[in-house]
């Protein structure tokens, strides 16, 4: 806290410029008008102030705007954004994507801070949904952003926004998140032809149901093992050996290396050993020949 003292004669700042770095903290407090500072915040970002001097400038803005800064000031906060508390940021009304970008740039290369998380939350809530341009921006700065959202939050993502999602943006998503995103992706890419469709939908397939995997198996997609291993176990189990062979194409040989891991392990246990042998991969653990398999869930449905 800087003591209130009168500004020395001739030192009253007429504009925000480099000469202010020669002001002591108390002089900045006494000689820089808060309203002038607010209108010339963009200049602050070109002046090499010390952190202590910036604290004084922030204090002046806090006094001028106790209910929260206007967007005209927020857009030019630069480093001062990192000095804000989440409580400060909750008072803001940020509507411009340019403002969001400018503040994310300041934090670029760092983990998502509480300030950034709060800013994004305020911005998205203000927009009402996670539109394509916002998603584009957020995933460019934070590739893991999408997977940090709850399934409930993801439900507000319109299918049109899915076009902005890159495969790496989904790396840390869990099955519950992919369950929400997959139907949106299916809708977004529905007008694409087979091979193009598969390229786009591939990253989302961790949320695909059995019937969609069966449909893909009819399209010569040659799914790689990495994608197959991310599929929902419950979606893979009903697939026949022939369907998995068609789904994987030349990659089917990779099943051998994954036979002890889910979902391959669980799928093998559900297949007839005779059928597995047709692959010629030496997969073991299928249902022995001559055994009768009762599907109890089907029996319950009939009774």
């Amino acid at each position: 806290e800087v003591e209130k003292t009168a500004c020395p004669s001739g030192k009253k700042a007429r504009e925000i410029d480099e000469s202010l770095i020669f002001y002591k903290k108390w002089e900045l407090e006494a000689c820089v008008d808060a309203a002038l500072l607010a209108t010339q915040m963009d200049r602050v970002n070109a002046i090499p102030f010390t952190y202590e001097q910036l604290d004084v400038l922030k204090h002046k803005l806090d006094e001028l705007y106790p209910q929260g800064y206007p967007e005209s000031v927020i857009q030019h906060l630069g480093y001062l954004f990192l000095k804000m508390s989440p409580e400060d940021i909750r008072k803001w009304n940020v509507t411009s994507l340019e403002t969001l970008k400018a503040l994310l740039e300041v934090n670029k290369g760092h983990e998502m801070s509480p300030q950034v998380a709060t800013l994004i939350d305020r911005f998205v809530k203000g927009r009402g949904q996670l539109d394509k341009d916002t998603l584009d921006t957020l995933t460019a700065f934070y590739p893991g952003y999408l997977c940090s959202l709850s399934p409930e939050e993801l439900s507000s993502v319109p299918p049109s926004s899915i076009w902005a999602v890159r495969p790496q943006d989904l790396d840390t998503c869990d099955p519950r998140q992919l369950d929400v995103l997959y139907p949106k992706a299916r809708l977004a890419f529905q007008n694409m032809n087979g091979s193009e469709y598969f390229v786009k939908i591939q990253s989302f397939l961790g949320g695909a149901p059995t019937e969609d995997l069966k449909a893909l198996s009819q399209q010569n997609v040659s799914m790689d093992l990495a994608t197959f291993m991310k599929l929902r176990t419950d979606a893979v189990l009903p697939l026949t050996v022939a369907e998995v062979q068609k789904l994987l194409g030349p990659h089917v040989e990779g099943l051998k290396a994954e036979e002890r891991h889910r979902p391959v392990r669980d799928w093998i246990l559900r297949q007839r050993q005779d059928d597995l042998d047709t692959l010629g991969l030496g997969l073991q653990g299928g249902i022995p020949n001559g055994y009768l398999v009762l599907d109890l869930s089907m029996q319950e449905a009939l009774s």
């Epitope: 090499p48 010390t50 954004f81 300041v106 670029k108």
Partner: nanobody, 115 residues
Framework: LQLVESGGGLVQPGGSLRLSCAAS????????IGWFRQAPGKEREGVSS????????NYADSVKGRFTVSRDNAKHTVYLQMNSLKPEDTAVYYC??????????MGQGTSVTVS
């Protein structure tokens, strides 16, 4: 983001020193740089500044005509040439920088003693 100062030391009154400010883990080229100093028991004060291009420089009244700030963007370094040093120039000298989007960096300081 971290800046690193060097070149401080002990010098006699009337002597000269050249301080350097370099960046650690990033490049200084698009950063405007300010030099500051803090004498024992006193508040940190501004000494000089230089724009990112090097085209604009400023000095505190107390060092005008004695100190010169410059930069060599090929070496990613900013210099403070200090001539005609006086005992009252004794302090820890720091550089601070501001780059694109208001990103900031500051150093830990280098000590200058004029005695």
């Amino acid at each position: 983001l971290q800046l690193v100062e060097s070149g401080g030391g002990l010098v006699q009154p009337g002597g000269s020193l050249r301080l350097s400010c370099a960046a650690s883990g990033f490049t200084l080229d698009n950063y405007a740089i300010g030099w500051f100093r803090q004498a024992p028991g006193k508040e940190r004060e501004g000494v000089s500044s230089i724009s990112s291009s090097g085209g604009s420089t400023n000095y505190a009244d107390s060092v005008k005509g004695r100190f010169t700030v410059s930069r060599d963007n090929a070496k990613h370094t900013v210099y403070l040439q200090m001539n005609s040093l006086k005992p009252e120039d004794t302090a820890v000298y720091y550089c601070a920088g501001v780059g694109n989007y208001g990103r900031r960096a500051m150093g830990q300081g280098t000590s200058v003693t004029v005695s």
